[in-house]
Amino acid sequence: TPLGPKWPEPVFGRLASPGFPGEYANDQERRWTLTAPPGYRLRLYFTHFDLELSHLCEYDFVKLSSGAKVLATLCGQESTDTERAPGKDTFYSLGSSLDITFRSDYSNEKPFTGFEAFYAAEDIDECQVAPGEAPTCDHHCHNHLGGFYCSCRAGYVLHRNKRTCSALCSGQVFTQRSGELSSPEYPRPYPKLSSCTYSISLEEGFSVILDFVESFDVETHPETLCPYDFLKIQTDREEHGPFCGKTLPHRIETKSNTVTITFVTDESGDHTGWKIHYTSTAQPCPYPMAPPNGHVSPVQAKYILKDSFSIFCETGYELLQGHLPLKSFTAVCQKDGSWDRPMPACSIVDCGPPDDLPSGRVEYITGPGVTTYKAVIQYSCEETFYTMKVNDGKYVCEADGFWTSSKGEKSLPVCEPVCGLSARTTGGRIYGGQKAKPGDFPWQVLILGGTTAAGALLYDNWVLTAAHAVYEQKHDASALDIRMGTLKRLSPHYTQAWSEAVFIHEGYTHDAGFDNDIALIKLNNKVVINSNITPICLPRKEAESFMRTDDIGTASGWGLTQRGFLARNLMYVDIPIVDHQKCTAAYEKPPYPRGSVTANMLCAGLESGGKDSCRGDSGGALVFLDSETERWFVGGIVSWGSMNCGEAGQYGVYTKVINYIPWIENIISDF
């Protein structure tokens, strides 16, 4: 029997009946055995076929077999109801070998030319399976030349049998207070040859409850308890199961905070598995009763371990733990069934006694000493000498615990001194220097510190003066002895003030003329305003209308008098403003340098002389009455003049204050 080629030789070739293409002889039997490499099969097809036709191909035939199985018995030229000719069919071996047998009987009625066939080895696609057959691989099948391999979906691993996919279903830990777990792929059939372990691990104090839901279908056996696939539930106290079959197991109250669920499957079966819904419970905490004027949130039927509630107070009430305030309050239920914090109170907000108002007073409107939520108080300033700045002085105790004005301010109102009050009214005509009476010049300040000088009180803690008068003390402010509220220069009865800082105008140059001869002294304490101590007003924008040529201003001080000595009593003089050009011309001639009088100066005095300020008056205010507000304001600061005070044709020169309003305001607001 001829053998076909064997692997590893190339597996392809031609087969033909003896004598082909001539007619074949009688009583012939020829056998070919073809062998392909492992993982390959043989493909065979006929290019010519002409054999004697007989019933069931009993006479002449070609038989194709693979292993023990006959693939085909062929005869004739074309197929009939009972006989088969190959035609254009292709034949495939079942494994890697194919047997071909040719036989002819003792006679042929006519000549037959036999057959010609070609064969070749080809790869078997093991991944292709006939309908109804078990798939080659559980999940994915991969064909390759000479073989195949299986792989698995994510979450599975290939079993050592190289075909089954076992679920990677261990190590899952459930830590939520409730949840669901199920067999892999549920409700589709669970995987074979798998061992799954699930853990429920809750905080100590919780107890896990297991409920089997929807459906339960785990492979079982009628006689033996769960020999194939089974589900087991283990706690630190006991084991439940094994479970299998189609009946939903009953609820399991584990009385444990940790549960291990084990699910084991074998290599066969087609079952949908199981689903567990788990919940937990714990020892409940006492039901929280909201304090008066407060409420609990969230409201629950019961509160167990880890549950919490917060307390919120009604508007106007605040959380207090005793005397201590809390912004928020949340209590958490503990494993022993107690709350971790005691219940606070919701107490009515108390803004407390209102702060004292300097130079003012406070009145309880709602009731004597009532300082709780929505209580009203009224601040007012001491009449005559103080006026309230910014707000109306009405404050309400608001829910945040602060006294708040109608404008929403939480700071105290300010009692600002009333400026420009004087006991004196202007005389309207000029006469000689006179002694001041009490209350005439309550802004007058006496400055002692090396020399005698003057100044004017601004607000209740600033003094306006001339730069040249305090220049020597600019770095030693504490050396200035500042006195006010007295008429007599040497009197022991005065109000003492001390300097905190001296601010000299940056444009002033000492011993180089008197341009920008202006300075401010900040006092280290506020002075109490009364009829003898009152600040002077700063000029309004419209003030120039009261300071035209020939308008009368008043200068006051303890400077040199006609007798050549410092005045014992405060003196004053009413003098007219002098035309600026006239004044400039008066100081153009020697010994005065050109440009001595600048636009930052104003001049006042009589052409005939005799009425003037003098040494010792420096820094004092030249004041004017604002007839609209009926308040006195500072128009000039005593600065310089002729060597001989009150000289005819010469005038007193004063720093023009209106030019320095921004400078004054900036320093006072910054410091």
Partner: antibody
Framework: DVQLQESGPGLVKPSQSLSLTCTVT?????????WNWIRQFPGNKLEWMGY???????SYNPYLKSRISITRDTSKNQFFLQLNSVTTEDTATYYC???????WGQGTTLTVSS | DIVMTQSQKFMSTSVGDRVSVTCKAS??????VAWYKQKPGQSPKALIY???YRHSGVPDRFTGSGSGTDFTLTISNVQSEDLAEYFC?????????FGAGTKLELK
């Protein structure tokens, strides 16, 4: 972790003012609670001086009200104690503490002496 | 002001003993009482608040009880590190007031 740290001069002359700072880390002083100043005299007697709350409201021991002020700087998470007109009787270790005293600073010792 | 009286300035104990430190308020303070432990050269350390609530990290051998005017701090199974001075505080009303302290020492 909540931490409080006091800082101050150590020595102050009688009649002067005392200023102490408490720096808080690990918790914002505006988030919640009262922030207290407490002092401990030689001999270990403890005295509560006052607090400033999360909202900035203050409460003082009535015995000190005329000369105490507690303020804060929320940007630096600090609160301050100012005690005016100190005398030798104010010599003590000064502590800052949160709420009912769940957290304390390590204390700063103050001596009032000329 | 509410006076907090710790009647015993000193208490002697042995390691392993159970000891109770008491504090009496001159007025009702509800449960607004805290307890502290202080060792020489250290700041006070919180133990108990609201009369019976243990502060976090405090060993459970420390127990607080009482309400109204009478309060007790109990230390069961005294350890050597418990030898210190103990103070009570009422925070029910202004001014907050402390007890004078009770020093726990070895017998």
């Amino acid at each position: 972790d909540v931490q409080l740290q006091e800082s101050g001069p150590g020595l102050v002359k009688p009649s002067q003012s005392l200023s102490l700072t408490c720096t808080v880390t690990g918790y914002s002083i505006t988030s919640d609670y009262a922030w207290n100043w407490i002092r401990q005299f030689p001999g270990n007697k403890l005295e509560w001086m006052g607090y400033i709350s999360y909202s900035g409201r203050t409460s003082y021991n009535p015995y000190l009200k005329s000369r105490i002020s507690i303020t804060r700087d929320t940007s630096k998470n600090q609160f301050f104690l100012q005690l005016n007109s100190v005398t030798t009787e104010d010599t003590a270790t000064y502590y800052c503490a949160r709420y009912w005293g769940d957290y304390w600073g390590q204390g700063t010792t103050l001596t009032v002496s000329s | 002001d509410i006076v907090m009286t710790q009647s015993q300035k000193f208490m002697s104990t042995s390691v392993g003993d159970r000891v109770s430190v008491t504090c009496k308020a001159s007025q009702n303070v509800g449960t607004n009482v805290a307890w502290y432990k202080q060792k020489p050269g250290q700041s006070p350390k919180a133990l108990i608040y609201s009369a019976s609530y243990r502060h976090s990290g405090v060993p459970d051998r420390f127990t607080g009880s009482g309400s109204g005017t009478d309060f007790t701090l109990t230390i069961s199974n005294v350890q050597s590190e418990d030898l210190a001075e103990y103070f009570c505080l009422q925070y029910n009303s202004n001014p907050l007031t402390f007890g004078a302290g009770t020093k726990l020492e070895l017998k």
